[in-house]
Interface confidence: medium
């Protein structure tokens, strides 16, 4: 069949599966006179043969891992054995079959992880190699955790990136790992080829021992410090410690205090630098920060709480220079005149601020001394002996001693004797009608004016009117302010009105005097008034708890992982349905009921971080009102990129035969983040068998030199495997291949007869 299995001599490429016994010829070349026979040269490896008549075949199974491409040349000879046609290049590409199992580089791995480490952040890599072609499923590896020991409550604390072999904590592992409970774990990890997708895949396993170390970067317990300490300062009160030595510590005062009496040294010990005053400030909250050698924060700040303990260093103080009370003529014995409330700046509800009251003097002592008594602990003044007469003594002055356990203070009280309170307040109308308001009426709004009058002595407690809402407002949404000159009452909104809980309120006001009524006079219906408040509904949209929700996850987090959640409430109490808007990359889904957000696709930091979407909360039923908030997902980089060659190095060659050892320079890179100093790669030969012919030496963090050790190379392509290690934590290694050809040169360029592909650069060394 001309063309497929036979034809004239020309450059050709054939693809043959490895591992298959020969079953047919490769090609039959036809001779054109004067050619009569054919000759085969190149990388035959004694496998490829051409018969004199032009029949090209192979005599045993090929092995791609030994040689992936055989570069052959076929020439046509005349009867005298002189080349009359060719040689032309014949390329045999060996196609891969899955004839190599993956193998882990180590049979046992050891690593450590700090408790509370970020979920998804790799702390250890397992690495397997497979000699099969990585461009086909045969060489595509899939890592899996087979078992975790111990397994507590069937919860996996560890996860593995099935492509990179990066081991990290799950969210549960980050929260629950505790070296005090379980200091070590063992994982059995499997690796499969065929991308893990085939029943016929080969596999290998390895064991990983993991030590859990304590995370010591945590907030200390709250500290108590006695005020006015006379001990020498500074005094150590607590400490923080970063997980590794060399951190720089500092304190941050978020409150921006005029004096900040705390310091931290470079061990992480925290000191109070001067005596504290509880009455100036009873508690301090500040932050300890750990920074690296450049001054950049290493982690989140820790909150430090200091409570200042009270001592009795303050005397009682009077409420005003003179406290004025009123008492009616003819008031009965035991009636309350008023309460003297002194203050003490020391801590409330302690012995240091517990006060005693005692009358030390009364003037005038008419008609006798001891007309008044004061309750020892409450400070309430009472009429002790008899009723008073305004025309005899219109005013009394009392000196009262107020004491705590260490200090005494004198306070002064003036008691004015006033006419009897025998008139009740009378409302100008008993019913103020209906008032309709929307539930979103502003707090502080005056919604109604009420008025009562009292015929007692003006500008005394007998005629002053206090308005109280005694019915219809158990929530305290309304209040009444009184004008002291006119006794007008202004009804104001104190708390938001709410249609859902109180659509109609029947409000009852009572007008009363601060002074008690005389015996026999009682408040009656004239002192009461009512009105009806009708609240109308305003449908309000759901309200998110935050304007922006932010979450942080590792970019290699497993699909289906919860990456964050949002919350909103509906003022009307309707159920809420959550949805996402603007998920342009299709990475996320939201639980419509709970607001939890999950990943549904692989995340990629390099595509942009943070990833911003909008979350929508919509009422279920009602008017279907909705609100929008932002969700920002910060994607953390993982060291998931092994080093690789910085560019395509096909076409490297040395002119054969070598006159002296030669060398060439190549550059490595990787796609991970690097701090100030850039990559710091180390280079070595990929296998021991290469060391007789080659050596590799580092030039700097990114470049290395590949040199020949001798000059005795065959005229063919050599594939030099080079191991590049990124020196990361943990280190990640890439094995790259540099194809180097030793070839005959013409004018310093590699001589590639007919069939040389144009466009591939060639570099001579």
């Amino acid at each position: 069949q001309e063309g497929k299995f036979s034809g004239p001599l020309k450059p050709m490429t054939f693809s043959i599966y490895e591992g298959q016994e020969p079953s047919q010829i490769i090609f039959q070349f036809k001779a054109n006179p004067p050619a009569v026979t054919f000759e085969l040269t190149g990388e035959t490896d004694n496998i490829f043969v051409i018969e004199r008549e032009g029949l090209l075949y192979y005599n045993r199974a090929l092995d791609r891992e030994t040689r992936s491409t055989h570069n052959l040349q076929v020439a046509a000879l005349d009867a005298n054995g002189i080349i009359v046609e060719g040689p032309v290049p014949i390329t045999i590409k060996v196609k891969d079959i899955n004839d190599n199992r993956p193998t882990f580089l180590q049979s046992k791995y050891e690593g450590s992880v700090r408790q509370n480490s970020r979920p998804g952040k790799p702390f250890l890599y397992v690495n397997a190699t497979d000699l099969d072609d990585p461009a086909t499923p045969n060489g595509q590896l899939y890592y899996q955790i087979v078992i975790q020991l111990p397994m507590i409550n069937n919860v996996m604390y560890f996860q593995i990136n099935n492509k990179t072999g990066a081991i990290s904590l799950t969210r549960e592992g980050s929260q629950e790992l505790n070296p005090a409970k379980n200091p070590s774990y063992n994982l059995v990890i499997s690796v499969k080829d065929m991308g893990g997708q085939s029943e016929n895949s080969f596999s290998d396993t390895t064991s990983v021992d993991i030590i859990v170390t304590e995370n010591i970067w945590k907030a200390p317990k709250p500290v108590e410090m006695v005020e006015n300490s006379t001990d020498p300062h500074p005094i150590k009160i607590t400490q923080v410690r970063w997980n590794d030595p060399g951190a720089q510590y500092s304190l941050v005062d978020k409150e921006k205090l005029p004096r900040f009496p705390f310091s931290i040294d470079q061990e992480g010990d925290i000191y109070v630098t001067q005596p504290l005053d509880r009455e100036e400030k009873d508690a301090y909250v500040f932050y300890a920060v750990a920074k690296d050698e450049y001054g950049k924060p290493l982690s989140y700040p820790l909150e430090i709480h200091v409570k200042v303990k009270d001592i009795n260093d303050n005397p009682p103080t009077c409420p005003s220079p003179v406290t004025v009370f009123e008492v009616q003529e003819n008031e009965r014995l035991g009636n309350s005149i008023g309460t003297l409330t002194a203050h003490d700046r020391d801590e409330e509800n302690t012995a240091n601020s517990f006060l005693n009251y005692r009358i030390v003097e009364q003037t005038p002592k008419l008609p006798m001394d001891g007309l008044f008594l004061i309750q020892t602990y409450a400070g309430m003044l009472q009429l002790a002996k008899q009723s008073l007469k305004k025309q005899d003594t219109p005013q009394y002055n009392l000196t009262i001693e107020v004491s705590d356990k260490d200090f005494k203070t004198l306070c002064f009280v003036q008691i004015n004797v006033i006419d009897i309170n025998d008139q009740i307040p009378i409302f100008e109308k008993s019913d103020y009608g209906n008032l309709t308001l929307a539930e979103d009426t502003n707090i502080g709004s005056t919604i109604l004016t009420i008025q009562a009058t009292d015929a007692d002595e003006p500008f005394t407690g007998s005629s002053k009117i206090l308005y109280h809402i005694i019915k219809g407002d158990s929530e305290g949404r309304l209040g009444v302010d009184t004008d002291p000159h006119t006794n007008t009452g202004y009804v104001i909104i104190k708390k938001p009105l709410d249609f859902e809980t109180a659509a109609v309120s029947n409000i009852v006001f009572k007008a009363e005097n601060p002074e008690p009524l005389v015996f026999g006079v009682k408040y009656n219906a004239s002192s009461f008034a009512k009105f009806t408040l009708i609240v109308t509904d305003v449908n309000e949209a759901p309200q998110f708890s935050q304007h922006v929700f932010q979450a942080k996850v590792s970019e290699d987090v497993a699909i289906g992982t919860k990456v964050g959640n949002v919350t909103a409430k509906d003022p009307e109490g309707l159920d809420i349905s959550y949805s996402l808007r603007g998920d342009t990359r299709g990475w996320l889904k939201i639980d419509h009921v709970t607001g939890e957000i999950f990943s549904v696709a692989p995340l990629d930091r390099e595509a942009g971080s943070p990833y911003r979407v909008q979350v929508v909360a919509t009422e279920v039923g009602g008017s279907s009102l909705s609100s929008v908030s932002e969700f920002h997902l910060i994607l953390m980089d993982v060291n998931d990129n092994p080093p690789r060659l910085a560019k395509d190095y096909t076409g490297l060659f040395f002119c054969h035969p070598l006159s002296a050892p030669g060398s060439l320079i190549f550059e490595a890179t990787d796609d991970d983040q690097h701090l100030f100093r850039g990559p710091h790669f180390t280079f070595s030969l990929g296998s021991g068998s290469l060391q007789n012919d080659w050596e590799v030496s580092k030039i700097n963090g990114t470049h290395a030199r590949l040199s020949t050790r001798h000059t005795e190379f065959e005229e063919r392509e050599y594939v030099v495997l080079i191991r590049i290690n990124d020196g990361g934590r943990p280190p990640l290694e890439g094995i790259v291949s540099l194809p180097v050809t030793f070839c005959s040169c013409v004018e310093g360029s590699c001589f590639r007869p007919a069939g040389h592909q144009t466009g591939i650069p060639t570099v001579g060394m």
């Epitope: 924060p297 290493l298 982690s299 989140y300 942080k552 930091r605 942009g608 971080s609 943070p610 911003r612 910060i634 994607l635 953390m636 980089d637 983040q673 690097h674 701090l675 100030f676």
Partner: nanobody, 119 residues
Framework: EVQLLESGGGLVQPGGSLRLSCAAS????????MHWVRQAPGKGLEWVSA????????YYADSVKGRFTISRDNSKNTLYLQMNSLRAEDTAVYYC????????????WGQGTLVTVSS
């Protein structure tokens, strides 16, 4: 290709002011924390300041707090550092850098601009 290009450096007297700019391209500027880092002659690198994408969060090293102000204009893809009350010890090459979060390593940074404070 990510590029960060600093400008605005120069010679200034002690007590004077300078404003540095950093023009960013090749990435979504508003998605990243941006930093200023400096290196004084013969000394190591020192982190100076950082700002979140919205400009709502800013951080400063103690040595510049109260004197330097970091800001950004996302519409112009530009980062700024306003330096007031300059001192001789502020003499350094100032670099701008980016990172996805405050605590992450810098993934790119610029070539730097020299600030010299001298009378």
């Amino acid at each position: 290709e990510v590029q960060l290009l600093e400008s605005g450096g120069g010679l200034v007297q002690p007590g004077g002011s300078l404003r540095l700019s950093c023009a960013a391209s090749g990435f979504t500027f508003s998605d990243y924390w941006m930093h200023w880092v400096r290196q004084a002659p013969g000394k190591g690198l020192e982190w100076v300041s950082a700002i979140w994408s919205s400009g709502g969060s800013t951080y400063y090293a103690d040595s510049v707090k109260g004197r330097f102000t970091i800001s950004r204009d996302n519409s112009k893809n530009t980062l700024y550092l306003q330096m007031n009350s300059l001192r001789a010890e502020d003499t350094a090459v100032y670099y701008c850098a980016k990172s996805p979060t405050l605590y992450d390593d810098f993934d790119y940074w610029g070539q730097g601009t020299l600030v010299t404070v001298s009378s």
